[in-house]
Interface confidence: low
């Protein structure tokens, strides 16, 4: 239904707290360099204006679209051109072009310092002094570093943060209470960020149809007892919610997500038997819980998939009459039978099925042609299954850090032109798949591994798009989203690459490395490892292990030495010589 004032409608639906949080996220995601105070001022102005519209929907400007209202606010910021360069040109455009322009200027890798967590005592003091400002800072800092973070989900993580601080700041040992809990939230939020970015990439590059196919597969796996009409309705609604969030329409997105959660909870009987615990929770927790609810038990009496999609005499007729609906039912039926497959794999199978029908239905004897289609799925299914087995075996043998190093070597060989920081970040993220997925039961490993890898590789593609340097990466990133991971997996050593010269300073370290936190130490060592591979792309695993063991021994020795600086300056050059010799 149409509302006289969109801003009043959203304020009323969402309530002041969520309204303000979402407006802050929106501004922080658009203008990523502005300080918290600058954004907080704008948020307060927008909120005050929304309240006047709630009081009188006919008041001046209350009938304007949210894009117009928000865009005007952003464009009124002083020194916009000095701070944001060509983004200021967006302000010369009219809506909807102005908003599109803002979206195009979102930076996936902003040059902002890492978000450092203050020490416990300081954090608790500022939280107690002003919880609202403290949480506002959290939303601002995360949103500006992750400009596509799913806004209603970020409100959920802020709520988690708030609950942890409330609990831990009351304890004697605040540090040991806060650290593991906040680490857990951070890890989950980072995964949420890359997953959502993947959804927005799908929407931006391939449109709503591609996203809806993803949603049909995912929802069919989770709700195998829901019928096709129900799954289609849920997929359509979920597509709308994600389109709005990816498009910067955060108030509409959060409002529609709340509506979808309400619908699911009111229609549990036709959706799933597993929703009740989620539906008992308050809004943010409920929507989060529904988004990762466990799969419902599969119906026991499902007929073989071949009946309707291979053996039926009407296959080509049904396909020709309504291609999208027929392919949608195939995806639904296949996905509900295979919660053990990744969504990416299910979409590849649906694509293969579609290509087979396109080819076969034009031939003289279609059934003879498409009769073997299910058998032809086999290699497509085996490939990711082998990937999971090989990588989980390697992870179990090496542990997370060793597994990350193995991936780093592999990916540096595949794309040595890519910057070392990007390779290290990618390998560290890809390596976490072991901890995240390899400890799961067998039937949950494949979906966990492949869909997580796809999301991480999407980030690799986004960063590479900014400065394309590797033909290998460009090739894999140019294809369809679901083919990316197999494409990257199939890459081998880049034979066109001219090895980097050996520079001693790249492998020169100082005593300050000794005081770094373990994570930073690992990154330093991994940076050196990537540089070694760039110098010798065909170095054997044994050679690299020898050098890295030597390097680890050197750090251990010098960091334990009484005179660390002397140790580093005398032993360092010897290490460099030994490295060169080992790789010769």
């Amino acid at each position: 239904e149409a509302h006289k004032s969109e801003i009043a409608h959203r304020y009323n639906d969402l309530g002041e707290q969520h309204f303000k949080g979402l407006v802050l996220i929106a501004f922080s995601q658009y203008l990523q360099k502005c300080s918290y105070d600058e954004h907080a001022k704008l948020v307060q102005e927008v909120t005050d204006f929304a309240k006047t519209c709630v009081a009188d929907e006919s008041a001046a400007n209350c009938d304007k679209s949210l894009h117009t209202l928000f865009g005007d606010k952003l464009c009124a910021i002083p020194n916009l051109r000095e701070n944001y360069g060509e983004l200021a040109d967006c302000c010369t455009k009219q809506e909807p072009e102005r908003n599109e322009c803002f979206l195009q200027h979102k930076d996936d890798n902003p040059s902002l310092p890492p978000f450092e967590r203050p020490e416990a005592e300081a954090m608790c003091t500022s939280f107690k002094e002003n919880p609202t400002t403290f949480m506002g800072h959290y939303l601002h800092e995360v949103a500006r570093r992750h400009p596509y973070f799913y806004a209603p989900e970020l409100l959920y993580y802020a709520e988690q943060y708030n609950e942890i601080l409330t609990q831990c700041c009351a304890e004697a040992d605040k540090e040991s209470c806060l650290t593991p809990k906040l680490d857990g939230v951070k890890e989950k939020a980072l995964v949420s960020s890359v997953r959502q970015r993947m959804k927005c990439s799908s929407m931006q590059k391939f449109g709503e149809r591609a996203f809806k196919a993803w949603a049909v597969a995912r929802l069919s796996q989770t709700f195998p007892n829901a019928d096709f009409a129900e799954i289609t309705k849920l997929a359509t609604d979920l597509t709308k919610v994600n389109k709005e969030c990816c498009h910067g329409d955060l108030l509409e997105c959060a409002d529609d997500r709340a509506e979808l959660a309400k619908y699911m909870c009111e229609n549990q009987a036709t959706i799933s038997s597993k929703l009740q615990t989620c539906c008992d929770k308050p809004l943010l927790k409920k929507a989060h819980c529904l988004s990762e609810v466990e799969h419902d038990t599969m119906p026991a009496d499902l007929p073989a998939i071949a009946a309707d999609f291979v053996e039926d005499q009407e296959v080509c007729k049904n396909y020709a009459e309504a291609k999208d609906v027929f392919l949608g039912t195939f995806l639904y039926e296949y996905s509900r039978r295979h919660p053990d497959y990744s969504v990416s794999l299910l979409l590849r199978l649906a694509k293969k099925y579609e290509a087979t029908l396109e080819k076969c239905c034009a031939e003289a004897n279609p059934p003879a042609c498409y009769g073997t289609v299910l058998a032809e799925f086999q290699p497509l299914v085996e490939e990711p299954k082998n990937l999971v087995k090989t990588n989980c075996d390697l992870y179990e043998k090496l542990g997370e850090y060793g597994f990350q190093n193995a991936i780093l070597v592999r990916y540096t060989q595949k794309a040595p032109q890519v910057s070392t920081p990007t390779l290290v970040e990618a390998a560290r993220n890809l390596g976490r798949v072991g901890t995240k997925c390899c400890t799961l039961p067998e039937d949950q490993r494949l979906p966990c591994v492949e869909d997580y890898l796809s999301a991480i590789l999407n980030r690799v593609c986004l960063l590479h798009e900014k400065t394309p340097v590797s033909e290998h990466v460009t090739k894999c990133c140019s294809g369809s989203l679901v083919e990316r991971r197999p494409c990257f997996s199939a890459l081998t050593v880049d034979e066109t690459y001219v090895p980097k010269e050996f520079k001693a300073e790249t492998f020169t370290f100082h005593s300050d490395i000794c005081t770094l936190p373990e994570k930073e130490k690992q990154i330093k060592k991994q940076t050196a490892l990537a540089e070694l591979v760039k110098h010798k792309p065909k170095a054997t695993a044994e050679q690299l292990k020898t050098v890295m063991d030597d390097f680890a021994q050197f750090l251990d020795t010098c960091c334990k030495a009484a005179d660390k600086d002397t140790c580093f300056s005398t032993e360092g050059p010897n290490l460099v010589t030994r490295c060169k010799d080992a790789l010769a």
């Epitope: 593991p180 680490d183 857990g184 890890e187 989950k188 989980c392 992870y395 179990e396 542990g399 997370e400 850090y401 060793g402 072991g434 901890t435 995240k436 390899c438 400890t439 799961l440 039961p441 067998e442 490993r445």
Partner: nanobody, 115 residues
Framework: EVQLVESGGGLVQPGGSLRLSCAAS????????MSWVRQAPGKGPEWVSA????????RYAESVKGRFTISRDNAKKTLYLQMNSLKPEDTAVYYC????????GSQGTQVTVSS
């Protein structure tokens, strides 16, 4: 050599509690996700619970959710399983595993729930 030694099993009445421990050695315990698996007489191994290397992410089989709690102490290289509200169907040999592998050759610890 990788070694996993479970302890803490025993005979307990329905509704009772037990805390299982698994002492690990011979590998970098803090780098690995760990699981508890159980095997009832005449049945195949059943996955019970898993925890990631840092202890932040935990997962449970439907049959034990809300009753069992998995945890770990990386400094002590020990994995734990707190089992409350035990039922006769929890009777099994329980053993800890690295990742999802069930072929680590540990002895396991017998848990019997009976009145």
């Amino acid at each position: 050599e990788v070694q996993l030694v479970e302890s803490g099993g025993g005979l307990v009445q329905p509704g009772g509690s037990l805390r299982l421990s698994c002492a690990a050695s011979g590998f970098t315990f803090g780098s690995f996700g760990m699981s508890w698996v159980r095997q009832a007489p005449g049945k195949g191994p059943e996955w019970v619970s898993a925890i990631d290397s840092g202890g932040a992410d935990t997962r449970y089989a439907e049959s034990v959710k809300g009753r069992f709690t998995i945890s770990r102490d990386n400094a002590k290289k020990t994995l734990y399983l707190q089992m409350n509200s035990l039922k006769p169907e929890d009777t099994a040999v329980y053993y800890c595993t690295i990742g999802q592998s069930t072929s680590r050759g540990s002895q396991g610890t017998q848990v019997t729930v009976s009145s």
